[in-house]
């Protein structure tokens, strides 16, 4: 039985050319996190592994920075970065927990952050 929940930064928006932090947090479980994957649609952005630390996919190396914590910082944002992002927590013994964040990259200078929400 998986008792944990993932809290994410939810629906967020940011300005073109700027940067944004994607954050997830796993709670309500004593499971041990063994790895966290960050994905954009079907593309792997980065991995944070308990043994090996961070690995950023080569195609994103210039624009993705690890952290803070298990989060991910996206830099030099373009309109093409708009879309769904997923944090995938691999845990023992529970298995996999997934959180979803929707990022909208705006041309204008008005970019407001959405409220946090939880995914069970």
């Amino acid at each position: 039985m998986m008792t944990g929940t993932i809290e994410t930064t939810g629906n967020i928006s940011a300005e073109k050319g700027g940067s944004i932090i994607l954050q997830c947090h796993l709670s309500s479980t004593t499971a041990q996190v063994t790895q966290v994957n960050w994905e954009q649609q079907d593309q792997l952005l980065a991995i944070c592994n308990a043994d090996l630390g961070w690995h950023i996919s080569p195609s994103f190396k210039d624009r993705v920075a690890p952290g803070p914590g298990l989060g991910l910082t996206l830099q030099s944002l373009t309109v093409n970065d708009t879309g769904e992002y997923f944090c995938i927590y691999h845990t023992y013994p529970d298995g996999t927990y997934t959180g979803r964040i929707f990022l909208e990259v705006l041309e204008s200078s008005v970019a407001e952050h959405g409220a946090r929400f939880q995914i069970p």
């Epitope: 039985m1 041990q32 063994t34 308990a50 013994p93």
Partner: antibody, heavy 121, light 108 residues
């Protein structure tokens, strides 16, 4: 060969302090979550504390009887976990075991042979 | 705190007999978090069964584990001389982690 070697045990007076060390080898220490478990003479096992991995923010958790008195820490560069024990009481007298657990597709659970802590005046 | 109560405290059996050790939890434990350890005199405990029913490396197939919720069981189908020891159940489903008081399996 996996080894966990505890050290630092001994005789200490009530109210005193002691720092236990557990040196690990033979497995990927940085990916292991580490615990201290104790066993009073002739008694059962009691969980004392744990420290998680970096990906778990090195989170620490404690048993009720030691909370606020004991501190667990780790040095991944030295493959060592520590237990700082303050305000020791007679009831802390026990063999203290270091335990390491690791999951990398298979689950592993390793124990040291223990170090005896005696709290007595 | 989840209290684990093991029964019986002592179990006296002969080699070849079947042994059933019980572990009852004061509140529900997720099955992935229920472990059994074996300990012999003067030795450190050894992981015996994890995740309720998975045998640790090197544990003979005569051992099995089962259960869910608040009731868990370790079974030995036919006792061998080396099986006589103390067995502890352990949960890490919620803080603080706890152990049962142990069942001593002794030769009759």
């Amino acid at each position: 060969e996996v080894q966990l070697v505890e050290s630092g045990g001994g005789l200490v007076q009530p109210g005193g302090s002691l720092k236990l060390s557990c040196a690990a080898s033979g497995f990927t220490f940085s990916g292991a979550w580490m615990d201290w478990v104790r066993q009073a003479p002739g008694k059962g096992l009691e969980w004392v504390a744990e420290i998680r991995t970096k990906v778990n923010n090195h989170a620490t958790n404690y048993g009720e009887s030691v909370k606020g008195r004991f501190t667990i820490s780790r040095d991944d560069s030295k493959n060592t976990v520590y237990l700082q024990m303050n305000s020791l009481r007679a009831e802390d007298t026990a063999v203290y075991y270091c335990r390491g657990a690791l999951y990398d597709g298979f689950y592993f659970d390793y124990w040291g042979q223990g170090t005896l802590v005696t709290v007595s005046s | 705190e989840i209290v684990l109560t093991q029964s019986p405290a002592t179990l006296s059996l002969s080699p070849g007999e079947r042994a059933t050790l019980s572990c009852s939890a004061s509140s529900s434990v997720s099955s992935g978090y229920l472990y059994w350890y074996q300990q012999k005199p003067g030795q450190a405990p050894k992981l015996w069964i994890y995740g309720t029913s998975t045998l640790a490396s090197g544990v003979p197939a005569r051992f099995s584990g089962s259960g869910s919720g608040t009731d868990y069981t370790l079974t030995i189908s036919s006792l061998e001389p080396e099986d006589f020891a103390v067995y502890y159940c352990h949960q890490w489903s919620s803080f603080p982690y706890t152990f049962g008081q142990g069942t001593k399996l002794e030769i009759k």
